[in-house]
Amino acid sequence: MGVEGCTKCIKYLLFVFNFVFWLAGGVILGVALWLRHDPQTTNLLYLELGDKPAPNTFYVGIYILIAVGAVMMFVGFLGCYGAIQESQCLLGTFFTCLVILFACEVAAGIWGFVNKDQIAKDVKQFYDQALQQAVVDDDANNAKAVVKTFHETLDCCGSSTLSALTTSVLKNNLCPSGSNIISNLFKEDCHQKIDDLFSGKLYLIGIAAIVVAVIMIFEMILSMVLCCGIRNSSVY
């Protein structure tokens, strides 16, 4: 005999919630695998600038995406299937996974906050290396793509410590179209924008993390309530 009333509502709520979660995981995993195997993006992600490889943050980034996507699909499946099948075992595993993920999120949040300066430094170093390579080797399309991505995403251009040649090449070729080279280079340069992202905009990342954490706690409560509901319904 299945669950009834409010517990039935929780069952379908948990199902829908986790189905969306499973789909999102699938999209992330798909994009990550595509990035990993597509020749153009592989060049971009494993960019070797001269004799300097891209910082470890970026090298590992793709695998983190793959792992996140896979875990999301797995946990989403557990929640989805566990709810629809009214399986205490699957829901218990789902709850355990959520507890582990919650702990990981807290740990990642603390690590990110503690190492934010190092991460920002890595990002700036990567930008500088890409910019240098784009100027020195004008055939380095992957380096140019990295530089243009930075410029368009952060709406910036160059940094305040540029060589004459780099300034000239940026002005004519790599700055976002219609941008003012003077203001871009000396007022809101990319180094400044990267620093802003990791300090001034840190609260946005914090808000996102809190939202995810609240959703996790909400799912933990729902899964426990449903688990108890299943246990109770099987008694009667």
């Epitope: 020195v136 060589s163 004459a164 300034t167 070729n173 003077i182």
Partner: antibody
């Protein structure tokens, strides 16, 4: 030893055209930015144009923009400057120079070729 | 009128120390762009003398030295020799004009 040898200069009428060449040797030409710098009689040096190693990036001084075109042939280790719609004020000794990314300057120069624009 | 201002001429006797100044603005030397110095004997190829404000390429005697302060730079030649008689040009990059800029040149005469 780095060597840059300019040629193609001479006397030309206003409105005329001229093509300067610069033969390079003693270094990996295809890996270096190259530039043209000129010096009008009794005046100082004036940067004219540069070209990147694979010809992707070029830039010009405002005084020659739209009239001069810089190009290169890496297989021949040669730099060119095509000069059209020449004016009297373009009269100068034109120097070919290698641009060093590391030093961020013109580290080697040729001896120059004289271009005289006169009717 | 050059963007970078240099004295038209300078002179000194052998063994003396001579300084040539190069005055720019906040859009070139003052903007943080390096100043470089070239030696030019008429009819020959200009030669890089000082790069990055104060560095000497290999082969340039240590009698030549460069410095930079604010919007100005200077070239000092100590123990002046007759072969130092030439035109000297300073060079930088101007971010407002987006061009490489040179000084008007200083003609150095070694007297006696």
């Amino acid at each position: 030893e780095v060597q840059l040898l300019e040629s193609g200069g001479g006397l030309v009428q206003p409105g005329g055209s001229l093509r300067l060449s610069c033969a390079a040797s003693g270094f990996t030409f295809s890996s270096n930015y190259m530039s043209w710098v000129r010096q009008a009689p009794g005046k100082g040096l004036e940067w004219v144009s540069y070209i990147s190693s694979s010809s992707t990036y070029t830039d010009y001084a405002d005084s020659v923009k739209g009239r001069f075109t810089i190009s290169r042939d890496n297989s021949k280790n040669t730099l060119y400057l095509q000069m059209n719609s020449l004016r009297a004020e373009d009269t100068a000794v034109y120097y070919c120079a290698r641009y060093s990314y590391d030093r961020d300057n013109f580290d080697y120069w040729g001896q120059g070729t004289l271009v005289t624009v006169s009717s | 009128q050059s963007v970078l201002t240099q004295p038209f001429s300078a002179s000194g006797t052998p063994g003396q120390r001579v300084t040539i100044s190069c005055t720019g603005s906040t859009s070139n030397i003052g903007a943080g762009y390096d100043t470089h110095w070239y030696q030019h004997l008429p009819g020959t190829a200009p030669k890089l003398l000082i790069y990055g404000n104060s560095n000497r390429p290999s082969g340039v005697p240590d009698r030549f030295s460069g410095s930079k302060s604010g919007t100005s730079a200077s070239l000092a030649i100590s123990g002046l020799r007759s072969e130092d008689e030439a035109d000297y040009y300073c060079q930088s990059y101007d971010t407002n004009l987006s061009v490489w800029v040179f000084g008007g040149g200083t003609k150095l005469t070694v007297l006696g």
